[in-house]
Interface confidence: medium
Amino acid sequence: AIELVPEHQTVPVSIGVPATLRCSMKGEAIGNYYINWYRKTQGNTMTFIYREKDIYGPGFKDNFQGDIDIAKNLAVLKILAPSERDEGSYYCACDT
């Protein structure tokens, strides 16, 4: 079975200081799947952020950078210049 495990349950981020979110794929090679990132905000709305390769949700391309780390089997999402509007719960997912 495939398992996607986040690096941290909570990530403290400073405004304007780049932050990195990571998910580890266990049980399979991450290169065999497409990685997706979503953000859930207070209203329980799930918003699409990123999908391999280089597909971004509206308004996310300028401040987010998605990638995979094949060497360590990680999905990576970088928030380039975090602001208060980036608060929320971030989810990684995969599909074929």
Partner: antibody
Framework: QVTLKESGPTLVKPTQTLTLTCTFS??????????VGWIRQPPRKALEWLAL???????HYSPSLKSRLTITKDTSKNQVVLTMTHMDPVDTATYYC????????????WGQGTLVTVSS | QLVLTQPPSVSAAPGQKVTISCSGS????????VSWYQQLPGTAPKLLIY???RRPSGIPDRFSGSKSGTSATLGITGLQTGDEADYYC????????????FGGGTKVTVL
Amino acid sequence: QVTLKESGPTLVKPTQTLTLTCTFSGFSLTTHGVGVGWIRQPPRKALEWLALIYWNADKHYSPSLKSRLTITKDTSKNQVVLTMTHMDPVDTATYYCAHEGDWGHYFDFWGQGTLVTVSS
Amino acid sequence: QLVLTQPPSVSAAPGQKVTISCSGSSSNIGNNDVSWYQQLPGTAPKLLIYDNNRRPSGIPDRFSGSKSGTSATLGITGLQTGDEADYYCETWDSSLSAIWVFGGGTKVTVL
């Protein structure tokens, strides 16, 4: 508590093969994401990355030394072994093994290093 | 074959601030996280900063890191005599297969 210790010969002759062993404790090289790398430092010079092996046996080598290097692991003994062929006096250096952080490409724990001198 | 460029030396008086630059390319620093190491004389390197700006537990907040484009910077404030050491930047290069790269090192001297 993570510890690593390098062992091997302190003196090798030119053209010989160097075999270094890194014996570690405090982590397992079967744990997802874990890697052990080798880095060397010639006297009064900079650090130079040599090789790295992962929990899943994936191996990575410095392009300039790839033909001379082999890295292997023995998870039952908690050891990583580096062999380097055709040793030359310019390979005289302190050789370190180090643990790579589970989530990133940085070395968070290092061995004390072992000085290897290549001379006839 | 150093692909990360650092100044050979920097110096400052106790209590002052020093910054060390590390310049790379799009395939290493530009696309990956940077780490910094402190090497006191006669000892093994020690991790100071990882993920560009994060400190391992036990590292004082006098040490800070940042990254912009293809360059990274290490800052040391409130310089102390015990900070006299060599400092190395490191990242990995994902242009071909994964390879790890170090800078040439910077000697920090406390005047």
